[in-house]
Interface confidence: medium
C-alpha cells in the first residue's frame, strides 16, 4: 500500500472549490404520497428500493459543515421483522429487519498551522464514521 | 453550505501519513466454511449479515492505490430471487434480489504544481464512484 501525506493549502496553490457531495444514497426526489412508508410497515410495489424492500427503511440526514462529505444519510428500519412477500404488509416473524452498518471514511477540516504557528488554511483529518446503509431481511441468528 | 479550498502539501507543513481505510463493510474475518454461501442460493442461520440475508451477497475487492480509499468492496448478489424465510434455501419468485447502489465520494491523487509549474506533491481530486453496497429483497416493481 502507498502512504499519502496529508495536505494543507498555502498561498499560491490552486484553490478549486471542493463542494459538498453526499456519499450514501441521497433519497431520490419522491412524491409526498410516499411519505407514509416512513410510518407504516409495508413494502411498496413501486418507488425507490428502500420502499420496495421487504425490510423497508427511511433515510435520516446527518449534516456537519466541518466534515466532508457534509451530508450523510443514515438508514432507519421501519419494521422489526420482514414484510410478507405475499401481501406486502403483514409481518413475517421468521425474518428480522436488521441494519447494515459500515465505517465511512470522512474528512474533518481543522486549522493548519505553519512553521511559526500562524494559521495557514485548513487541513483535512481523516476519520472513520459509522453509518447505517440499509435494512436487510435476515434469518434470525441461531446460537450453536 | 461552506466551500472548502482544495489542498496541496508544501514543505514545512504537517505530513502525517494517510493510511488506507476501506469504506464499505470489510468482509468480516470468517471461517472458510462460509465460502459455500458464494456458490449456492441459501440464507445461513449464522455468520455475517450478507450470509444471513434472504438476498445474500458476497463482496468483491476493488483496489486502486491512487485512490482514497484504496480498497472498496462491491456487493454481488448470489441469487436472482429471495430465499424463502421458511427453509433458508428454496427461492421465492415473488421477491427479487436487487443491488443497492450509491455514489461514493473518493479522492484521486494527482500531481500538484506550484506557481512556476514545479511539482509540489499531490493534490486530492474528489470524484463520485459508483459502488454496490448490498443486495436487498424487494417486491417486483409493478408498472402502472
Amino acid at each position: 500500500y502507498s502512504h499519502w501525506p496529508s495536505c494543507c493549502p498555502s498561498k499560491g496553490y490552486p484553490s478549486e472549490e471542493l463542494l459538498r457531495w453526499s456519499t450514501v444514497p441521497v433519497p431520490p426526489l419522491k412524491p409526498a404520497s410516499l411519505d407514509f412508508h416512513s410510518v407504516s410497515c409495508r413494502a411498496s410495489e413501486d418507488g425507490p428500493l428502500n420502499s420496495r424492500a421487504i425490510s423497508p427503511w427511511r433515510y435520516e440526514l446527518d449534516r456537519d459543515l466541518n466534515r466532508l462529505p457534509q451530508d450523510l444519510y443514515h438508514a432507519r428500519c421501519l419494521c422489526p421483522h420482514c414484510v410478507s412477500l405475499q401481501t406486502g404488509s403483514h409481518m413475517d416473524p421468521r425474518g428480522n429487519s436488521e441494519l447494515l452498518y459500515h465505517n465511512q471514511t470522512v474528512f474533518y477540516r481543522r486549522p493548519c498551522h505553519g512553521k511559526k504557528g500562524n494559521h495557514k488554511g485548513y487541513c483535512l483529518e481523516r476519520r472513520l464514521y459509522r453509518v447505517s446503509l440499509a435494512c436487510v431481511c435476515v434469518r434470525p441468528r441461531v446460537m450453536g | 453550505y461552506s466551500h472548502w479550498p482544495s489542498c496541496c502539501p508544501s514543505k514545512g507543513y504537517p505530513s502525517e501519513e494517510l493510511l488506507r481505510w476501506s469504506t464499505v463493510p470489510v468482509p468480516p474475518l470468517k471461517p472458510a466454511s462460509l465460502d459455500f454461501h458464494s456458490v449456492s442460493c441459501r440464507a445461513s442461520e449464522d455468520g455475517p449479515l450478507n450470509s444471513r440475508a434472504i438476498s445474500p451477497w458476497r463482496y468483491e475487492l476493488d483496489r486502486d492505490l491512487n485512490r482514497l480509499p484504496q480498497d472498496l468492496y462491491h456487493a454481488r448478489c448470489l441469487c436472482p430471487h429471495c430465499v424463502s424465510l421458511q427453509t433458508g434455501s428454496h427461492m421465492d419468485p415473488r421477491g427479487n434480489s436487487e443491488l443497492l447502489y450509491h455514489n461514493q465520494t473518493v479522492f484521486y491523487r494527482r500531481p500538484c504544481h506550484g506557481k512556476k509549474g514545479n511539482h509540489k506533491g499531490y493534490c486530492l481530486e474528489r470524484r463520485l464512484y459508483r459502488v454496490s453496497l448490498a443486495c436487498v429483497c424487494v417486491r417486483p416493481r409493478v408498472m402502472g
Epitope: 450453536g144 | 471461517p31 472458510a32 466454511s33 465460502d35 459455500f36 458464494s38 456458490v39 449456492s40 442460493c41 441459501r42 445461513s44 442461520e45 458476497r58 454481488r76 448478489c77 448470489l78 441469487c79 436472482p80 433458508g88 434455501s89 428454496h90 427461492m91
Partner: antibody, heavy 120, light 107 residues
Amino acid sequence: QVQLVQSGAEVKKPGASVKVSCKASEYTFSNYGISWVRQAPGQGLEWLGWIGAYSGFTKYAQKVQDRITMTTDASTTTAYMELRNLRSDDTAVYYCARVGTGTDSYFDFWGQGTLVTVSS
Amino acid sequence: DIQMTQSPSSLSASVGDRVTITCRASQNINSHLNWYQQKPGKAPKLLIYTASSLQSGVPLRFSGSGSGTDFTLTISSLQPEDFGIYICQQTYITPLTFGGGTKVEIK
C-alpha cells in the same frame, strides 16, 4: 429428477487442454453452484473447485488454480471445466456435482463422470 | 488443508449386521461433514449431510453422528446392496477434502 450429464471421454497429450461440459436439467440452474471433483485411477476423490451458476463466483483448489477455469452458461444450463497444460497425473475421472442449498455445503447430485486420459 | 482419516480402510460383514465406520478430521470442523457411497465405476451418492441429516431417498438404516473431529456412519442392518466404498467429506474450510474411503464387502 435432477440430472447432470457430462461430455464424453477425452484422450489428450501432455501440455494440451481439455474442456469438460456438464449439462444440468430438471432444476433451476441459477439457484445452485456446481462443483468439480476428480478421481485418479484407484485413488480417492479430490475437490477442484466450484462456481456459482448465478453469481459467477469461483473458488479453485490451490493445486490447480493456475491451470483451471470454471464457467457456466445460463442459457444452456451447462457448466464447463477447462484444465490447461495437462500432465500425466491429471489422468482421472472428472465429476461435476450440484452444490445443495441447505444450511451446509454438500454435493447432492453428481454427473456420470468423464474420463480424461493424458498420455504421450 | 484438513486431513480426513477413515477407519477401517475395509471391512467384511454379513447381511443384517450393524456396521460402523469412523472419520476423524485433523482439526475441529463442527458439524460440517458429509458421507457418500460410491460403487465401482459410478459417481458418489450423498447419504448424510451436516454430520447427521439423512439425504432424501436414503434408507433409514443409514445414520450419522458426531461433531468436532470425530464422526461416525452407522448402517443398522447391512443389506446386500450396501456394498461399496463409503467416503467422508469436510466442508468446513476450502479446499474441501475427502477421506480415503472405507470399502464394505458383503460376506
